[in-house]
Each structure stands twice: as structure tokens, then as C-alpha cells.
Interface confidence: medium
């Protein structure tokens, strides 16, 4: 008479997360007397998945009946996989013991694996804005995938990057993983229409990489460029001067005109352009009253972007001169030209 | 023919630690359940637990908390320890093979038993 | 744990006679699964018959099991003068494995 043997055919299940699986287990004999008991591992820790004596298991069914009486069948489903689930499960047959059933007979155990999906790449820039030729990280974040091989891929509008650094966590065995990613792109003025994508390509999405963007709109600041130029007359004692902002973003500005040094008026940017790049332009003009000034006047055209140090630009209007004889004077001295901008 | 041959301290003090080795001549390890057996002066027979050659052990639950029974596969031996030892643990103590496919077994071979007496 | 009272404590025969020895469990055995065995003075117990009646290596055929669920029986048919001892019946049907406390047989 040959003993008990504890059968399991699978040595290793692959199914996908949310799907049922399937642990087979046949015994080779009706005896001992005793239940099968299922188990994730070995050794003390183990976790008890089914008992065919007792207990309550909701997740588990089993494939053939147990209470009939020349059953050899203990296979078993799992539904609901998710990746914690994985691990090695063992058939034991226990035989009859007092106070508790004594472990008899276990199976060389089914590995299982969980392939799960990973989940929707996030990628995050700077916290704060940058200004064009400046080097910026993005970083790009994806978890609860299964198995740990992974492909990640960094494009910014459709071109591949190659400055990136990836991590998948953990390094060991694990039921699920995460990967980590950060990717440094140089930004260009052209930039405010830009894309960075962040792809991530696993066995579970079945050539239909997944993926995440960020726009550079929310990652750059392109600094205005100041011009002040001086219009041909519109009355008698007065000159039309223009303070042209172009090429900036965001459009957060404020412009204030200073008249020899005092503060002549200020205004937001409302009504702009939008260039074809994304960034913006805007005018200002100031009527200056020639009659009421004695000696020459220095205009300044002050303008705070986004929250930046202010940058200005200044155009000297000679009262001596008769107003209808100056024309559009673009080369005007700026005694203030030298634009400030503070990364 | 199989033989057992067991060895081991045969007088103890009260809390001492018994010991005793069972050697398996003249047939196969593996495949057998091997078993301590204990028998008190004038009494019957008490089984006190097995061992597989795989290591897996089951010990009467009314000395678990102070039995370890061991197994050595390349000397074809196994041991028995019972801590915290007593008067009460002064018995004739016998090694045997345990035969059978139930997943429990009757005994078809027996050491020649070593009388282990705990005294003050 | 299943308990094994075996009857009566002490047998009084004579060789020749037949003697029938109780065993009984307080709850249900698989009838494959008692044994019997003898144990003599200063001596191992003996394996006599385990199973379906089967009986051990050199055991003569006088020595024969009978019974089931909570009772047994061993009978030895013709008593000689070497089988009187101490008999034990053993179950191996549930964990812990128990005995009984034995019957002597004696020469009366």
C-alpha cells in the first residue's frame, strides 16, 4: 500500500490582478482520515488561506465537492486577485488528532504571481517657475505594478530625452513595485507651449504604454523685453509716449510710469496678444503734458512680472525741442536700459 | 534486521534537563514516523512524540511545552529532551519506529528502553 | 485524545485455556487502526497484530483480533506457557496516539 502523496501539479500560477486563480491539489489517497488545509509560505508564519473543516474564507471556493466521500480533489479559487496575494500556497493534509488536527502531508506548493497593472504615470516639475536656458527636473512616479520589470521612457513634445535617472523600489521581492524617475530638461523661450511626457510601458498593458504629462507652461517664466518710444505729437504741448512689452509669460505684469522718478501711473496687463509661441505682448502709453514741464523729463517705463524684481527702461524727452519736429525717436537714450533679471 | 539501540543519562536531579539518543541500524530512515515512548514503573505505555526524517514533529500536547525531539539524517539517530524534569518523569523510556499509512502508525520496532530516574 | 480502558486489570488462566481480552475506546476507531502488543519482565512491548487483523512477523495464528468502533477483542485460542504477560491494545486512528493500561495475563 503506497502513502499519501499531496499532488500539485502547478509549480508556478501567473494571473492578472482583479481575475480568479486556480491552486490545484489532488491526494493520491483517502487515508489518512483528516482535512486539507491551504497555506501562503511555511514554517510558523504561514497564513491560513483555507480550511476544509472550518472557518469562514469568502474569497475561496473550492473546484470539486469536499463532503463527497471518495473526494481527492482539493483545488481551490481564488477570486479578487490583487498583488498582495502573491506567494507560494501549499495543500497540507492533516490527519486526526486532540486537541487539533496534526499536519500530515503537504505539496511542493504553486507560486503565485499577480500581474498587476501600473498605475497612471504622475510627473511633477519645479515648485517654482524658470526662465529660459535653465536646467529644470520633472519627475515621474507610477506604483502597484507586477512583475518589477518596467520600461520607462522621458519625451518632451515627441522627442525622446536621455537625461534621466530611474529607481524601481523596492530592490527585493516584493508583491508590487513602484517606479521613480527624474528627468532634467533645459527649458527654451519657445517652450510655454511644450509638453513633457513621462511613458511607462509593463507586460499588463499589452503594448498600450500608459502616460503622464506636464505642461512647461506651469514650469516657465519668459521675462518681457522692454522698448519705450516716443510717438509724433498729438496736440500742441504733448507727446505720446509707448512702453511695448513683448515676449513674456505668464501674464501676471504690472507696469508703472515714472515721470523723473515719480510715480505717474500704474497698470495691469489686460488686454494682450498672445504670440503664436504662447507668450504674450502688451502696450502702455503715456501722454505726457510738454507745457507743464520746464526741463527735460525722464520717462521710465517700470515693469514687475510674475512676481520678479521689476525691470525698466527709460526714454529722455527734451522740452527745448519743439515737440512737432520729433518723430518716432526709437533710438531714444535709455539711462536705464540695462534690463535686471533675477533667476 | 532493524535495530534501535537508544542512550543517555539514567539519574537526574529535579529541573534537570533529560536527554536521551536512539540509533536506527539495519534499515531504512526515511519513510518511517520515529517515536519516544515512556513507561512509568508498574503503569502502561505513554507515546510522547515523533519525528519524520523530514523533521516534522507532533508531541502529545500533555508534554509540549517541555519535549523536543530532534533528528540527525546522517547518523541515522534522533533525540529526545524533556526540560524541567520531575518525579513524576521517572520512567523506563523507549525509542521505536512507527509503521503505517493511516498518517498514524502502530510500532513494529523498539529500542531496548533505558529506566531514567529523577531524584533530589 | 481517545481513551482506552482495557478489561479486566488481571487474567487468571491456565495453559490450554482460551483467553479474550477487552479493549475499548471512548469514541469511534477505525477497526485498521488498533494494535495489540505484549510485553514481558524487563523486556520492549511486542508488536502482535495491527490493521485489518494482521498479524506481526513470527506471531503464531492462536493470537486473533476481533471488533469494532468502540470495542475489541484479543483472543489467544490455546494458551502457552510464553504468553503469559501484560497486553496493551494501542489506537494510531487520531493524534495523540494512547494505549491502554493493559491486561496481565497470569498463570492461575
Known amino acids: 500500500e503506497e502513502e499519501l502523496q499531496v499532488i500539485q501539479p502547478d509549480k508556478s500560477v501567473l494571473v492578472a490582478a482583479g481575475e480568479t486563480a486556480t491552486l490545484r491539489c489532488t491526494a493520491t489517497s483517502l487515508i489518512p482520515v483528516g482535512p486539507i488545509q491551504w497555506f501562503r509560505g511555511a514554517g510558523p508564519g504561514r497564513e491560513l488561506i483555507y480550511n476544509q473543516k472550518e472557518g469562514h474564507f469568502p474569497r475561496v471556493t473550492t473546484v470539486s465537492d469536499l463532503t463527497k466521500r471518495n473526494n481527492m480533489d482539493f483545488s481551490i479559487r481564488i477570486g479578487n486577485i490583487t498583488p498582495a496575494d502573491a506567494g507560494t500556497y501549499y495543500c497540507v493534509k492533516f490527519r486526526k488528532g486532540s486537541p487539533d488536527d496534526v499536519e500530515f502531508k503537504s505539496g511542493a506548493g504553486t507560486e503565485l504571481s499577480v500581474r498587476a497593472k501600473p498605475s497612471a504615470p504622475v510627473v511633477s516639475g519645479p515648485a517654482a517657475r524658470a526662465t529660459p536656458q535653465h536646467t529644470v527636473s520633472f519627475t515621474c512616479e507610477s506604483h502597484g505594478f507586477s512583475p518589477r520589470d518596467i520600461t520607462l521612457k522621458w519625451f518632451k513634445n515627441g522627442n525622446e530625452l536621455s537625461d534621466f535617472q530611474t529607481n524601481v523600489d523596492p530592490v527585493g521581492e516584493s508583491v508590487s513595485y513602484s517606479i521613480h524617475s527624474t528627468a532634467k530638461v533645459v527649458l527654451t523661450r519657445e517652450d510655454v507651449h511644450s509638453q513633457v511626457i513621462c511613458e511607462v510601458a509593463h507586460v499588463t498593458l499589452q503594448g498600450d504604454p500608459l502616460r503622464g504629462t506636464a505642461n512647461l507652461s506651469e514650469t516657465i517664466r519668459v521675462p518681457p523685453t522692454l522698448e519705450v518710444t516716443q510717438q509724433p505729437v498729438r496736440a500742441e504741448n504733448q507727446v505720446n509716449v509707448t512702453c511695448q512689452v513683448r515676449k513674456f509669460y505668464p501674464q501676471r505684469l504690472q507696469l508703472t510710469w515714472l515721470e523723473n522718478g515719480n510715480v505717474s501711473r500704474t497698470e495691469t496687463a489686460s488686454t494682450v496678444t498672445e504670440n503664436k509661441d504662447g507668450t504674450y505682448n502688451w502696450m502702455s502709453w503715456l501722454l505726457v503734458n510738454v507745457s507743464a514741464h520746464r526741463d527735460d523729463v525722464k520717462l521710465t517705463c517700470q515693469v514687475e512680472h510674475d512676481g520678479q524684481p521689476a525691470v525698466s527702461k527709460s526714454h529722455d524727452l527734451k522740452v527745448s525741442a519743439h515737440p512737432k519736429e520729433q518723430g518716432s525717436n526709437t533710438a531714444a537714450e535709455n539711462t536705464g536700459s540695462n534690463e535686471r533679471n533675477i533667476y | 534486521q532493524v535495530q534501535l539501540q537508544q542512550w543517555g543519562a539514567g539519574l537526574l536531579k529535579p529541573s534537570e534537563t533529560l536527554s536521551l539518543t536512539c540509533a536506527v541500524y539495519?534499515?531504512?530512515?526515511?519513510?518511517?514516523?520515529w517515536s519516544w515512548i515512556r513507561q512509568p514503573p508498574g503503569k502502561g505505555l505513554d507515546w510522547i512524540g515523533e519525528i519524520n526524517h523530514s523533521g516534522s514533529t507532533n508531541y502529545n500536547p500533555s508534554l509540549k511545552r517541555r519535549v523536543t525531539i530532534s533528528i540527525d539524517t546522517s547518523k541515522n539517530q534522533f533525540s529526545l529532551k524533556l526540560t524541567s524534569v520531575t518525579a513524576a518523569d521517572t520512567a523506563v523510556y523507549y525509542c521505536?519506529?512507527?509503521?503505517?499509512?493511516?498518517?498514524?502508525?502502530?510500532?513494529?520496532?523498539w529500542g531496548q528502553g533505558t529506566l531514567v530516574t529523577v531524584s533530589s | 485524545e481517545i481513551v482506552l480502558t482495557q478489561s479486566p486489570g488481571t487474567l487468571s488462566l491456565s495453559p490450554g485455556e482460551r483467553a479474550t481480552l477487552s479493549c475499548r475506546a471512548s469514541q469511534s476507531v477505525s477497526s485498521s487502526y488498533l494494535a495489540w502488543y505484549q510485553q514481558k519482565p524487563g523486556q520492549a512491548p511486542r508488536l502482535l497484530i495491527y490493521g485489518a487483523s494482521s498479524r506481526a512477523t513470527g506471531i503464531p495464528d492462536r493470537f486473533s483480533r476481533s471488533g469494532s468502533g468502540t470495542d475489541f477483542t484479543l483472543t489467544i485460542s490455546r494458551l502457552e506457557p510464553e504468553d503469559f504477560a501484560v497486553y496493551y491494545c494501542q489506537q494510531y486512528d487520531s493524534s495523540p496516539l494512547t494505549f491502554g493500561g493493559g491486561t496481565k495475563v497470569e498463570i492461575k
Open positions: 521505536a519506529r512507527g509503521r503505517g499509512y493511516s498518517g498514524y502508525y502502530y510500532f513494529d520496532y
Open positions: 539495519g534499515g531504512s530512515f526515511s519513510g518511517y514516523y
